[in-house]
Interface confidence: low
Amino acid sequence: DFGLDCDEHSTESRCCRYPLTVDFEAFGWDWIIAPKRYKANYCSGECEFVFLQKYPHTHLVHQANPRGSAGPCCTPTKMSPINMLYFNGKEQIIYGKIPAMVVDRCGCS
Amino acid sequence: DFGLDCDEHSTESRCCRYPLTVDFEAFGWDWIIAPKRYKANYCSGECEFVFLQKYPHTHLVHQANPRGSAGPCCTPTKMSPINMLYFNGKEQIIYGKIPAMVVDRCGCS
């Protein structure tokens, strides 16, 4: 699998992964004990036909061209978890692996 | 996990799974021996904030609002394979499980 990596200086217009640090303190999310910030990354960019298509299905839908199908969009195609320490609704401290918190790769889907 | 199912008579504007039969013969894809047609389905519709979001990450990116992030789009969140019989590039007949050919669920990602 392949995906592009970019930053704010990139001139790339196609679907790409960009760096993003999420800051829970800045959001006022005080129920999160750790981490206070983490590297989430995000996907942005154009999905020209066939570029970075993750699934053959995407190509087939384009070929069939049904009513209302909008074409593929730039979205996470590989994600990974992070460990978090947080208060749940009952004010208990929970340590757990939270899935799909980090974008590792972007593609057109 | 939850996803909406719609059909061509639905008035639903939000992200939804629609039925789609892919017809390989109609495409002229004569290297596919079987199936000649199959139910692929597709995703279409609007992704209002928080509706059908698959990942907490989607919410966090919306909150952080980085430059160029386009907001979530309606995309397959669960897919399944189908078995296919086809000719490969060397004219050999191959029987195999092809991943991600059927959309089982749609969501905002």
Epitope: D5, D7, R37, Y38, K39, P81, N83, M84 | -
Partner: antibody, heavy 122, light 110 residues
């Protein structure tokens, strides 16, 4: 106790090879990124490379080809194989564990060994 | 590859004084910066990661700030045990692979 212990350092002639070991205890080796960092006498820290959770390796450009990082999960040990050694490779070699993925920061080394001295001299 | 430049090279201050160490990256590194403290004969100790997050067990007098290319480590009130060399470190690129350290700043107690 959670710790990293390096071994295998010593005196080696120019052009020679050496394999350093880093024995880990108190945690599962394969759950963390492991890195090697060196420090020449009186100098600053210099990154050599890492082996990630999947077992993929990444190296500083100067180390590529001469230095190889590997691991043996069954022995809870990470290795640094050094070939074609030169006088300028004389340094204390540290093994370090990547920060756990609170924050998903692969290269924040939050646990270090005490280091092992490698001297390259004839 | 990104190059990290620390200033000053050496700093000599009295206990209780405020210490400001600088680290500059040759290109934007977002928040991908860590600070380490190293005392003679010891391995480095992680103080700060992601530019401003205090590592576990680190006293609150240490504070990291900055983003992009300019970063600062501040010790609000210098203690005798803070005498050490301080290194900044980044990852080279979004994919996290490749690391660069600054050349270090030595903090001495008068």
């Amino acid at each position: 106790e959670v710790q990293l212990v390096e071994s295998g350092g010593g005196l080696v002639q120019p052009g020679g090879s050496l394999r350093l070991s880093c024995a880990v205890s108190g945690f599962t080796l394969s759950h963390y990124v492991k890195g090697w960092v060196r420090q020449a006498p009186g100098k600053g820290l210099e990154w050599i490379g890492i082996i990630n959770i999947e077992g993929s390796t990444y190296y500083a450009s100067w180390a590529e080809g001469r230095f190889t990082i590997s691991r043996d999960n069954s022995k809870n040990t990470v290795y640094l194989q050094m070939n074609s050694l030169r006088a300028e490779d004389t340094a204390v070699y540290f093994c370090a564990r990547g920060h756990d993925n609170f924050g998903y920061s692969y290269h924040d080394f939050n646990l270090w060994g005490q280091g092992t001295l490698v001297t390259v001299s004839s | 590859a990104v190059v990290m430049t620390q200033s000053p090279a050496t700093l000599s201050l009295s206990p209780g004084e405020r210490v400001t160490l600088s680290c500059q990256a040759s290109q934007s590194i977002h928040h991908d910066l860590s600070w380490y403290q190293q005392k003679p004969g010891q391995p480095p100790k992680l103080l700060i990661y992601l530019a401003s997050t205090l590592a576990s067990g680190v006293p609150s007098r240490f504070k990291g700030s900055g983003s992009g290319t300019d970063f600062t480590l501040t010790i609000s009130s210098l203690q005798p045990e803070d005498a050490a060399t301080y290194y900044c470190q980044t990852y080279d690129g979004i994919s996290h692979y490749g690391v660069a350290f600054g050349q270090g700043t030595k903090v001495e107690i008068k």
